[in-house]
Amino acid sequence: AGVFELQIHSFGPGPGPGAPRSPCSARLPCRLFFRVCLKPGLSEEAAESPCALGAALSARGPVYTEQPGAPAPDLPLPDGLLQVPFRDAWPGTFSFIIETWREELGDQIGGPAWSLLARVAGRRRLAAGGPWARDIQRAGAWELRFSYRARCEPPAVGTACTRLCRPRSAPSRCGPGLRPCAPLEDECEAPLVCRAGCSPEHGFCEQPGECRCLEGWTGPLCTVPVSTSSCLSPRGPSSATTGCLVPGPGPCDGNPCANGGSCSETPRSFECTCPRGFYGLRCEVSGVTCADGPCFNGGLCVGGADPDSAYICHCPPGFQGSNCEKRVDRCSLQPCRNGGLCLDLGHALRCRCRAGFAGPRCEHDLDDCAGRACANGGTCVEGGGAHRCSCALGFGGRDCRERADPCAARPCAHGGRCYAHFSGLVCACAPGYMGARCEFPVHPDGASALPAAPPGLRPGDPQRYL
């Protein structure tokens, strides 16, 4: 037997950007409290699975009211340790969940409104009797600093609290076969004597003189196997030879307890032990209240303390469902316009916009030409989130800053020679061709292939085209 102890040092905003808002306001002052849940082993268990090693709730911290405009500081904490007693051996490896809860102190419905601010979890190895272990855990934008240890309750000692110690009977040494109890050198290890004859394989004891059976075994010395088959006898005392325990018609047959309640027989009838959130003779009445902490993912629980009261969970962005248990894929609604990329950050939605678009949802089409000058007489043309310059003759490049070589594209057809000119280019045509780009063949009879002669000229008159 022993006690797991948890000391919370601080709870406040973690390092880095995105400091959380203070959980309390001037209108609704609040205070913090903590819950710790311990489970044996290193298994990754759901937060809702039982706290098999035990659980504890802290006292309420001092009332805190936010200073308007101030960032959330480290919040005032409850006094004292959280202590989780354990009856059996300390397992050495354990999983923990530490929850930080906010209790509002406004004009409440019938009980305080509670909401889970942060939940941290981890798996650790820890020997009982060792020093305090320090830890820092982050949950979203919050940071929790704490220390923990496991210590044995006398007379238990050892890394698992399974050895028992007694004060020495003789001042000099311990009895035959018994060692001194480190670190209590003035005490001796005490033999744990179970009931005489208790099966060493199937029985064990936590107190001297007892004999407790492992599952599947029965009898005063745990030597009789429990079998529910190969038994022909009716309901009644178990057979000493076979150990058969055949259930007959009893008040708990068929389990009359609803909603996962467990049934135990009483002298007159039966009794249901109901799970959290249910009550009534057969656990048939649902009575979840905010005290049961039904809201997940930082949801705020609002409702009365009476089991008949309704409750509602006010959900933070990104969660939905009656208990805020479902994550919303907000990007599936395609909120980002103009081809923007949607990012769901949990606490907020972000749109990464394509070039030329801006705004929370990329809804603003930027004036691509605003502040964009095209040099050398070029004109800016908008389109598709990017700007383009239509350059004046003789210039090129993105901003018309480059002097273009008009002959680079070989604009003169049929072997014409190209000459750069201040106003553009000039083609000197090869014999038999004419036109600004030497594109027209001259017919042998002196007429050109032009569809019609320019006004004032007769076909066959000499023409000159540059």
Epitope: S25, R27, L28, D107, L300, V302, I312, Q320
Partner: nanobody
Framework: EVQLVESGGGEVQPGGSLRLSCGPS????????VGWVRQAPGKQRNLVAG???????NYAQSVKGRFTISRDNAKNTVYLQMSSLRAEDTAVYYC?????????WGQGTLVTVKP
Amino acid sequence: EVQLVESGGGEVQPGGSLRLSCGPSEIITSDKSVGWVRQAPGKQRNLVAGISNVGSTNYAQSVKGRFTISRDNAKNTVYLQMSSLRAEDTAVYYCYARDFENEYWGQGTLVTVKP
């Protein structure tokens, strides 16, 4: 300070019906959780019915199947349709709204169920 205003209360016989309204008010927006809270003489306040900001409804065990809560976001109004009324439903009914930072209450409307 903006307050919620309830209407529709009154005296009714057992088995009768009433419809309570709250609003219109700029407080009653889709990002708020809203509900109806009642307080019988000598008893504590209890949430009878509520609609969360994500649209989930919940009812007190004693009114399930008899009361229906609804909201009209366009009209900024919340309603409570009460039928098959019983003597134990006699109470002052308050309209309630809240978000993470604030909570809002109405002055209450009295519902009396008596033969």
